[in-house]
Amino acid sequence: RPSRVYKPEGNTKRALTLKDILNGTFSYKTYFPNWISEQEYLHQSEDDNIVFYNIETRESYIILSNSTMKSVNATDYGLSPDRQFVYLESDYSKLWRYSYTATYYIYDLQNGEFVRGYELPRPIQYLCWSPVGSKLAYVYQNNIYLKQRPGDPPFQITYTGRENRIFNGIPDWVYEEEMLATKYALWWSPDGKFLAYVEFNDSDIPIIAYSYYGDGQYPRTINIPYPKAGAKNPVVRVFIVDTTYPHHVGPMEVPVPEMIASSDYYFSWLTWVSSERVCLQWLKRVQNVSVLSICDFREDWHAWECPKNQEHVEESRTGWAGGFFVSTPAFSQDATSYYKIFSDKDGYKHIHYIKDTVENAIQITSGKWEAIYIFRVTQDSLFYSSNEFEGYPGRRNIYRISIGNSPPSKKCVTCHLRKERCQYYTASFSYKAKYYALVCYGPGLPISTLHDGRTDQEIQVLEENKELENSLRNIQLPKVEIKKLKDGGLTFWYKMILPPQFDRSKKYPLLIQVYGGPCSQSVKSVFAVNWITYLASKEGIVIALVDGRGTAFQGDKFLHAVYRKLGVYEVEDQLTAVRKFIEMGFIDEERIAIWGWSYGGYVSSLALASGTGLFKCGIAVAPVSSWEYYASIYSERFMGLPTKDDNLEHYKNSTVMARAEYFRNVDYLLIHGTADDNVHFQNSAQIAKALVNAQVDFQAMWYSDQNHGILSGRSQNHLYTHMTHFLKQCFSLSD
């Protein structure tokens, strides 16, 4: 009989294809329990049943069947805290980044039927249960409504709501995108007695208008109140209503701290501390001063009082307050003291304990690394994430500080769990952190596990992506390295994605992928199979991502370097990195490209127009081209105001249009969605106009009716295919 031919495993493996990426063939799963108590959670199964789990009794059963879900085409659900009702969400219709409208049905779990009579109107902009019982608050046509029980008629709390003018309980465009990062602006008190909400008045805000072509004979115009840099901003007011008898006193306005109210300001977040204590955070329009104000309900006055001695000021002298956002407080059990992340004297963001004043704050963590997020504070423990471990800024590990001990002791919960596979974690805690889930995002295959909150012992693997692991066995994946390079006194972390059969003695084309926005991070120890993975795997391109000045979690000196001068150091540092990569000896100097999206499109455009001759070609997708065209909250946070007596000069100097002449010697592909509500098509239109005026040849592609994400399946396929052709042509790679 013929002998078996031995085939080395390497030969049986295939490279990734663009189709793999576009089809999402190698996407991974995560498992986040929907906690409903200390030891119970819900989870939507693969077949769309909503399953109840009790960790301690090991009990599990279907609480809501997929047939019930299917009967109203539900794609999401929410259980009332008294467990009597479930809302079912269907007809999901995306609006902006977080916001969407939907139709909601209430299902009575006791009766096993939908609640009839006084059905909810449609479409609803936001809906949520009270934290206790089964009261419902919802926003419809920019007004807030309350139902004492699902079958009750609604009570209308606000009447001022008006499309594109006044928003109650939901943010307007700029607050949604740049301040709250949520679709809601209402918060129940822990006992469900009070409901706090924000009213956003956009009446005086200039409108951005753009065409939406659709299928009709005439395009329709989308109008959004959108304050660009220096423009009039929303006027915000915070109200709290007693939901027991909302019709009696009516909503009560919460006073704004005097030092904030004296000029333009923002509301930045609201945190309920206890049933009659609330914490509001405010920010001056010049975003270097933040005030945290603790307010109490005065039963005798029937009012919310915010004493001056309960105002805590956070100020930055080197840049803006906070990181991307100002951090939120994590209150202790005493409902007075709290833990908060802000910059220490060395400019590193760390956890501080505030008992009375910020000046007397006790620093809890310290070092040349940063605390990133406080997950939970319990009676005896504080759980947080940081990038301390082994000095890699792009890692995330979860730590526990035993605050009951004196001095507090620190333990890394995740550092040594699956060290090779897992270096980037997030966590989800049950009510008092009795149990928690860890979700590891890489660098290996993502894995989700369940843990005991006291011992940190792993109880169960919730999702380990076995199918993905099996399907990747026969794929030639590129090698990923995370390293640092030094230039002068600066250290830049980079991620390099190397083709599967990488040989240091050969020369490879290089593609820089850049984002580079303030307080962002691209060099992260996470797993991904995406377009750049394909470019390395199949097309033999070396990919590099570099975190230059202005990026996050490496201290304020590095972060605030870009303050008031966007578009300078971000670009400079990409150029420095490219020169260093060339020195490594395996980069073909004649075939270097750069690409980026959004802020990355801005940086890639400026890098291409740097006049260095380093880049042969590049792509900008949905780039900002002038900070005057972008949202006030974002632009002004980093650039100040575009006025003569502030920073107009740099606003003008930092535009892509100002460098139109310098595009003459590069191949430039400019791409934008025409219905981009975020970075308006105007940005690319102005770049194109400047290039035409300068008689510079370039390539362009627009995506009709696509927004900032260019997310529709067809558009995505076209986009990545188009960019691939462009790159392969630039690098002289055969099709």
């Epitope: 009579g117 006084y118 139902k147 004492q148 029980r149 009750d152 008629p153 009570f155 209308q156 009447y159 001022t160 007011r237 109200f239 027991t244 008898y245 019709h247 009696h248 006193v249 009516g250 909503p251 009560m252 306005e253 005065r298 005798d300 006055w301 029937h302 009012a303």
Partner: antibody
Framework: EVQLLESGGGLVQPGGSLRLSCAAS????????MSWVRQAPGKGLEWVSA???????YYADSVKGRFTISRDNSKNTLYLQMNSLRAEDTAVYYC??????????WGQGTLVTVSS | EIVLTQSPGTLSLSPGERATLSCRAS???????LAWYQQKPGQAPRLLII???TRATGIPDRFSGSGSGTDFTLTISRLEPEDFAVYYC?????????FGQGTKVEIK
């Protein structure tokens, strides 16, 4: 002790104007929604208007565009400016503590008579 | 607007007797928003019941409220001489808040 004291009522011709006042004491006026409720002679109660502590105003359809509710928190006083008065506006006008219900304190009322 | 219809229009009873007053709404009213008031001649109304069944501060326990949806009841278990007055139900569920036309409880 909570007290509400209305004033400003009287006889006025149709088309005329009148301004009612309600002086409040015994509670934190600036924190509460306040209403005007009227009662035509021998008839039932009719809600006229309300104002939140923060100043938002609400009106019954029958008076919208003619009546204006306002408040001066520094003076602990509620007002009702009544213009274009009609015979059917004749009533005792009460000021009451509350927005849309649970009116827990009432003034003694002031009589407005609209007649030629 | 929500119309509240009270019955009977007049109730003639003797002190010590039980009085049952009815209030029917033209559409459903959540219990939280239903109140009862008492008004004596030449006086301002006085709040008796909030949330359909909770007595307001200082109201004697002979007054009780019940009901839900569209049917609500005020009960005075044993009429005292000072209880003879006009009683109004009121809804605060929607704007405009409305009152019933009143039930007069008179001495028989």
């Amino acid at each position: 002790e909570v007290q509400l004291l209305e004033s400003g009522g009287g006889l006025v011709q149709p088309g005329g104007s009148l301004r009612l006042s309600c002086a409040a004491s015994g509670f934190t006026f600036s924190s509460h929604a306040m209403s005007w409720v009227r009662q035509a002679p021998g008839k039932g109660l009719e809600w006229v208007s309300a104002i939140w502590a923060s100043g938002e105003q609400y009106y019954a359809d029958s008076v919208k565009g003619r009546f204006t509710i306002s408040r001066d928190n520094s003076k602990n006083t509620l007002y009702l400016q009544m213009n274009s008065l009609r015979a059917e506006d004749t009533a005792v006008y009460y000021c009451a503590k509350g927005w849309l219900g649970n009116f827990d304190y009432w003034g003694q009322g002031t009589l407005v008579t609209v007649s030629s | 607007e929500i119309v509240l219809t009270q019955s009977p229009g007049t109730l003639s009873l003797s002190p010590g007797e039980r009085a049952t007053l009815s209030c029917r709404a033209s559409q459903s009213v959540s219990r939280s928003y239903l109140a009862w008031y008492q008004q004596k001649p030449g006086q301002a109304p006085r709040l008796l019941i909030i949330g359909a069944s909770t007595r307001a501060t200082g109201i004697p326990d002979r007054f009780s409220g019940s009901g839900s949806g569209t049917d609500f009841t005020l009960t005075i278990s044993r009429l005292e001489p000072e209880d003879f007055a006009v009683y109004y139900c009121q809804q605060g569920q929607v704007i405009p808040p409305t009152f019933g036309q009143g039930t007069k409880v008179e001495i028989k």
